[in-house]
């Protein structure tokens, strides 16, 4: 019962996490104009991984895609790559984990196969979450560096008269979505790995042979000497595995993922 719950919860948490990673990757607000001393602005700039946008006071918003690959900063390319790798791994992980779910019966799939698939998807979720967290963190670091650089030369005076105010950028909503989503995917992956341990069938026991002095026919008794021989002594696993109370129709319903704004 606990294994199914852990596996199911891990799947749902990862699903929400990956949906969040996809949302963060698509969002335009990775960096937003810093309104350091002017909370109300007539022109508001914000940037994403794929395009930069400008919102005017009237509400009119204009976005321009980055139509160049070579002209983009290497760091931005790296962040894009990390996020895409995270999404791809997460998507594959989700696909694998669907078939690995204890509550879903597919043909005569053995528990050992389901355990392996659960572990595989768990590892994929962990790597996916780490990729997202790394991508967002690299971008955040890039922002912090640029922020202080632009603060240092905030006003570049031309003859001391004309001022060119440099636009400073700060953390956008997508960074927080990415961090949270990456963390959820990571947690979901860990839960899947934990569930895998519970799903793994017991080690193969040697079939104990009972010898009788009378020379009667040999009786094979599976697990007969378990307590005394030390074979298959993983009682913890046995307890969970032989719980018996677990049914195939114990499918829990989980809340659906809500899109941001």
């Amino acid at each position: 019962m606990a294994v199914t719950a852990c596996q199911g919860l891990g799947f749902v948490v990862s699903l929400i996490g990956i949906a969040g990673i996809i949302a963060a990757t698509c969002m335009d607000q990775w960096s937003t104009q810093d309104l350091y001393n002017n909370p109300v602005t007539a022109v508001f700039n914000y940037q994403g991984l794929w395009r930069s946008c400008v919102r005017e006071s009237s509400g009119f918003t204009e976005c321009r895609g980055y139509f160049t690959l070579l002209g983009l900063p290497a760091m931005l390319q790296a962040v894009r790559a990390l996020m895409i790798v995270g999404i791809v791994l997460g998507a594959i992980g989700l696909l694998v984990s669907i078939f690995a779910l204890k509550c879903i019966r597919i043909g005569s799939m053995e528990d050992s196969a389901k355990a392996n698939m659960t572990l595989t998807s768990g590892i994929m979720f962990i790597v996916s979450g780490l990729c997202a967290i790394a991508g967002v963190s690299v971008f955040a670091n890039m922002l912090v560096t640029n922020f202080w650089m632009s603060t240092a030369n905030m006003y570049t005076g031309m003859g001391g008269m004309v001022q060119t105010v440099q636009t400073r950028y700060t953390f956008g909503a997508a960074l927080f979505v990415g961090w949270v989503a990456g963390g959820l995917t990571l947690i979901g992956g860990v839960m899947m790995c934990i569930a895998c341990r519970g799903l793994a069938p017991e080690e193969t026991n040697y079939k104990a042979v009972s010898y009788h002095a009378s020379g009667h026919s040999v009786a094979y008794k599976p697990g007969g000497f378990k307590a005394s021989t030390g074979f298959g002594s993983n009682t913890k696993n046995k307890k969970i595995y032989d719980g018996g109370a677990r049914t195939e129709d114990e499918v829990q319903s989980y809340p659906s993922k809500h899109d941001y704004v």
């Epitope: 002017n38 007539a42 700039n45 006071s57 009237s58 204009e62 321009r64 060119t164």
Partner: antibody
């Protein structure tokens, strides 16, 4: 066609308040930001603030903050600008103008203006 | 606040001649996010409200004759009337549309010589 029709001229005493209306027609009222600009006799133009008719959100020039209040009546597609604690230097023609959505924050339509005279 | 300075204060030009008005801002009106300049030009005739001529420093408003041309970027802008007509006699204002508070130039009066 787009029209912005303002209320008539007003004569006020110093310390009093004035409320100027601007009735709009010919376009979707809540889709465009409305601005107020004033012009003292023989002087240049001075931006006072603006209001988003959809949310009722306002942005005021620091110079007028605390003295100016901009409101909207969506049922009649009318914008109001109230200026309190009037002084003689507030004597001016007050214009309402529409922010031309996608026109880089420029004002594409203007009211005919309302002359407010502050005199004791 | 951004200070807008127009020059000259007044301008007398013969009919059919070119009139050039300059506008200088104390801060750049260029927005790097969309590579646009946030400057507008208005024409005001006596007893009338201002009329939008140019927005985004160089884009002509619909219905405005093509003899009106806006140019410039950053802090220096120009309004050119290629061939002055009698109906162009007015006061011309430039406006900072980049940052609050919106500010206007003091105006340039164009007359016929």
């Amino acid at each position: 066609q787009v029209q912005l029709v303002q209320s008539g001229a007003e004569v006020k005493k110093p310390g009093a308040s004035v409320k100027v209306s601007c009735k709009t027609s010919g376009y979707s009222f809540t889709d465009y930001l409305m601005l107020w600009v004033r012009q003292a006799p023989g002087q240049g133009l001075e931006w006072m603030g603006n209001i988003n008719p959809y949310y009722g959100r306002t942005t005021y020039a620091l110079k007028f903050k605390g003295r100016v209040t901009m409101t909207v009546d969506r049922s009649t597609s009318t914008v109001y600008m109230e200026l309190s604690s009037l002084r003689s230097e507030d004597t001016a023609v007050y214009y309402c103008a529409r922010d031309g959505y996608s026109l880089r924050n420029a004002m594409d339509y203007w009211g005919q203006g309302t002359l407010v005279t502050v005199s004791s | 606040d951004i200070v807008m300075t127009q020059s000259p204060y007044s301008l007398a030009v013969s009919l059919g001649e070119r009139a050039t008005i300059n506008c200088k801002s104390s801060q750049s009106l260029f927005n790097s996010g969309n590579q646009k300049n946030y400057l507008a030009w208005y024409q005001q005739k006596p007893g009338q409200p201002p009329k939008l001529l140019i927005y985004g420093a160089s884009t002509r408003e619909s219905g405005v004759p093509d003899r009106f041309t806006g140019s410039g970027s950053g802090t220096d802008f120009t309004l050119t009337i290629s061939s002055l007509q009698a109906e162009d006699v007015a006061v011309y204002y430039c406006q900072n549309a980049h940052s609050y508070p919106y500010t206007f130039g003091q105006g340039t009066k164009v007359e016929i010589k």
